[in-house]
């Protein structure tokens, strides 16, 4: 299953499959997730080691048993790959690192006014993988405001150095935020020239294209079909690059297919997995296990559940079958692709779905009225769980926020439905940033069921929580995916990085905002909160957040929206915007429904009809 816990001051011994430099443990974990054989990783921050060569070292590891011995190492951080973690699998990494210079091949230098502008330039440059920006206070005046666009053979920095007044980060192309746009066409009987960066075997051009998309240096590809004249080159997928970023020439060639990486697509990228099953095809590779199962789909599920399995072949040969069950060969290779592809066989083959980010039809947990005042504009994909709950009577308007917690589930505040319990009047918009982008043609979700907490009473602040079951499940994308829930009764975690988001009023007597707002707000203890609200009972099922001096808060129209906190690199839904005395008033924190206290209720209500809890636990 999915394991998300990080081990501090611990280093996994042995099992090394690759090493690289990364700016933090989360980026190291992402590289492990996308490496075909990596199950575990260890990261050495600059503070953890004197050896300059090993600072920022990210060590990717494999293990036949799925685990390795941990040794104590002060400052080291270790953890697991996020393979099998559904919607948490993403190559998108937005963080900007202050005080570090990520080294690589500098191929473009320009003057820009901010690090965000530098990141945007990198994202809009086809070859840029990461960048460094010298701030206005950089010690050498001639380098100030310099934006250096960079690449490297592996897509990660060739070195990382601590350097004051320098900020570094990665291209946001994997976040589907590139302005370049992409070529979706696949060209038959055409071969591209230029530099081959890798060679893998694939069953069709679509798998070849997906592998190209997620390869750090592939910009385009040529695939040799299963009837290519040279037998040894059949099913070869050549991943390619060029100085210009486009093929310098193409040659008409029977039984070849060429196309482009989809990394520069805007708003949608292919999933980093291959779900199709190929009848009449055998995939060769290193044998991991052989098991008898009923049907090729069960074989694929078996492969997906066995974390080291990369691909499989389900044999229909009479000698491989007993009654209704046949042999399911679970296999792997060094690069994650078959070492041999044979056609015209009595097998069916396919790939593990361990990197599919759609996950199952579940809500996500982890084991470990009231707009935003004093906030700033959010950007695309920053809060992909945020939804807008709108009511369509004669006109249509935004009333509340909500949080996507599963393909078919939204968590919000019960008081949003005061006087409006009819599910037909509600429209739920997900994957949006600007309310003004909503037109009559914008897709929305309708409500199948509104589940208000049984102990909620109108005009009381208690149990202000409601679940919405959508009529149809939503697909996950970089702009529309769920927030993980905390574990039941989560009281031990100290959250220091919490944000509230919404389209609500920007002042007490204001109006709904167009662009989704965000504000960073500290949590306040319940004791402190109770002192500020002596006329109300602040229960253990509430959580408060706000600045003593006021000025930043949720407000009308934010109700039902998320209070999220980042812990160990993962966002969790800590609270649901519920109530407060006015908005952003001095010594009047906002009050939120404490989600951890309602986990049993959420799990009970989101159980599927067959009684199986629709939960996906990354721990």
């Amino acid at each position: 299953g999915c394991l998300t816990q990080l081990y501090e001051n611990a280093f996994f011994r042995g099992g090394d499959v690759a090493s690289m430099y990364t700016p933090n443990a989360q980026y190291c974990q992402m590289r492990c997730t996308f490496h075909p054989r990596c199950l575990l990783f260890s990261f050495l921050p600059a503070s953890s080691i004197n050896d300059m060569e090993k600072r920022f070292g990210c060590f990717l590891k494999d293990s036949v048993t799925g685990t390795l011995p941990k040794v104590h190492r002060t400052g080291a951080v270790s953890g697991h790959s996020l393979k099998q973690c559904g919607h948490q699998i993403s190559a998108c990494h937005r963080d900007i690192y202050k005080g570090v210079d990520m080294r690589g091949v500098n191929f473009n230098v320009s003057k820009v006014s901010s690090v965000e502008e530098c990141q945007k330039r990198c994202t809009s440059n086809i070859r840029c993988q990461f960048f460094s920006y010298a701030t206005q206070t950089f010690h050498k005046a001639e380098y100030r405001n310099n934006c250096l666009l960079k690449y490297s053979p592996g897509g990660t920095p060739t070195a990382i150095k601590v350097l004051s007044n320098v900020e570094s980060g990665f291209s946001l192309k994997p976040c589907a935020l590139s302005e370049i746009g992409c070529h979706m066409n696949i060209f038959q009987h055409l071969a591209f020239s230029d530099v081959d960066v890798a060679r893998v075997l694939t069953p069709d051009a679509f798998v070849c294209r997906t592998i190209c998309t997620y390869h750090p240096n592939c910009l385009f590809f040529t695939f040799y079909t299963n009837v290519w004249k040279i037998e040894s080159q059949r099913n070869v997928c050549l991943l390619k690059t060029s100085e210009s970023g486009t093929p310098s020439s193409s040659t008409p060639q029977e039984n070849t297919i060429s196309g482009y990486s989809l990394l520069t697509c805007k708003r949608t990228l292919p999933e980093p997995c291959h779900s199709k099953i190929y009848p009449g095809v055998d995939f060769g590779g290193e044998e991991l296990n052989v098991t008898f199962v009923k049907g090729v789909n069960v074989c694929q599920e078996t492969c997906t559940k066995m974390i080291r399995c990369q691909f499989f072949t389900y044999s229909l040969l009479p000698e491989d079958c007993k009654e209704e069950k046949c042999k399911c060969f679970l296999r792997l290779s060094m690069d994650g692709s078959p070492t041999r592809i044979a056609y015209g066989t009595q097998g069916s083959s396919g790939y593990s779905l361990r990197l599919c980010n759609t996950g199952d039809n579940s809500v996500c947990t982890t084991k470990t009225s009231t707009r935003i005042v004093g906030g700033t504009n959010s950007s695309w994909g920053e809060w992909p769980w945020q939804v807008s709950l709108q009511v369509k009577l004669t006109a249509q308007r935004h009333l509340c926020g909500g949080s996507l917690i599963g393909h078919q589930w939204v968590l919000t505040a019960a008081h949003c439905f005061d006087g409006l319990p009819l599910q037909d009047v509600w429209r739920i918009y997900s994957g949006i940033l600007n309310l003004s982008d909503i037109t009559k043609d914008t897709p929305f979700s309708q409500i199948k069921e509104i589940i208000i907490h049984q102990n909620y009473k109108v005009s009381e602040g208690n149990h202000d929580i409601a679940l919405i079951k959508l009529q149809a499940p939503l697909n996950y994308t970089e702009f529309q995916k769920p927030i993980c829930l905390p574990s039941k009764g989560d009281t031990s975690t100290i959250y220091t990085n919490c944000w509230v988001t919404g389209w609500g009023f920007s002042k007490e007597k204001g109006e709904i905002q167009n662009i989704l707002q965000k504000v960073n707000i500290p949590l306040v203890t319940n004791e402190e909160c109770q002192k500020r609200y002596q006329d109300y009972k602040i229960t253990q099922r509430m959580v408060c957040a706000g600045y003593k001096e006021g000025g930043k808060d949720a407000c009308k129209g934010d109700s039902g929206g998320p209070l999220v906190c980042k812990h160990n690199g993962m966002w969790r839904l800590v609270g649901i915007t519920s109530w407060g005395e006015g908005c952003a008033r001095r010594e009047q924190p906002g009050v939120y429904t404490k989600v951890a206290e309602y986990m049993d209720w959420i799990l009970e209500k989101t159980q599927s009809s067959d009684g199986k809890a629709q939960m996906q636990s990354p721990a």
């Epitope: 056609y343 009595q346 759609t358």
Partner: antibody, heavy 120, light 107 residues
Framework: EVQLLESGGGLVQPGGSLRLSCAAS????????MQWVRQAPGKGLEWVSY????????DYADSVKGRFTISRDNSKNTLYLQMNSLRAEDTATYYC?????????????WGQGTMVTVSS | DIQMTQSPSSLSASEGDMVTITCRTS??????LNWYQQKPGKAPKLLIY???SLQSGVPSRFSGSGSGTDFTLTVSSLQPEDVGTYYC?????????FGPGTKVEIK
């Protein structure tokens, strides 16, 4: 020239049997998975059956499972569909089709079709 | 089985008009979606494979887009020879299924 040519259609009574053939030419037949697709008069396309290149694996639409059998003879470059226990709703034009596998099972080669009428 | 829906079921447009047909699948199929054109009394003809790639020999006025569950076939400038019925088909998982079809006529 790549070609598929169906034959064997005709009028048959409910409960009767019929065997359709599809002769392939112009390509290496044994490399390709083959399909039967049908179309009832005035209606849409319905996938009927599929056979692996080797003939070792087959698949059927629920509507024909247990009554129809797909087979192939790679030495004769021919695909077959044995249809038993025919019903009025099996009345359709039957097409054989194949996919140049690397197009992801898009059917880029089709026959001209053969008409099967089930009526008393 | 993967269910397919197509809209509209029929349309009538003038020569030179842009025509759009949509296809929706009951589950995600990546880009394993194909479009066919069928003229009366003829076998279907592959137009677009892999959601967006033009089959060789097909005029460039035909284009396809989409991934996951929502797909579109666009004819940028309708010609008299484009009259016929258009079908989408998923080739992601067996049984392969077709949409119910969209009949295109010229006004």
């Amino acid at each position: 020239e790549v070609q598929l040519l169906e034959s064997g259609g005709g009028l048959v009574q409910p409960g009767g049997s019929l065997r359709l053939s599809c002769a392939a030419s112009g390509f290496t037949f044994s490399w390709y998975p083959m399909q039967w697709v049908r179309q009832a008069p005035g209606k849409g396309l319905e996938w009927v059956s599929y056979i692996y290149p080797s003939g070792g694996g087959t698949d059927y639409a629920d509507s024909v499972k247990g009554r129809f059998t797909i087979s192939r003879d790679n030495s004769k470059n021919t695909l077959y569909l044995q249809m038993n226990s025919l019903r009025a709703e099996d009345t359709a034009t039957y097409y054989c089709a194949t996919s140049s596998g690397w197009l992801g099972d898009a059917f880029d080669i089709w026959g001209q079709g053969t008409m099967v009428t089930v009526s008393s | 089985d993967i269910q397919m829906t197509q809209s509209p079921s029929s349309l009538s447009a003038s020569e030179g008009d842009m025509v759009t047909i949509t296809c929706r699948t009951s589950r995600r199929i990546g880009t394993y979606l194909n479009w066919y054109q069928q003229k009366p009394g003829k076998a279907p003809k592959l137009l677009i494979y892999g959601a967006s790639s033009l089959q060789s020999g097909v005029p460039s006025r035909f284009s396809g887009s989409g991934s996951g569950t929502d797909f579109t076939l666009t004819v940028s400038s309708l010609q008299p020879e484009d009259v016929g019925t258009y079908y989408c088909q998923q080739s992601f998982s067996s049984p392969w299924t077709f949409g119910p079809g969209t009949k295109v006529e010229i006004k």
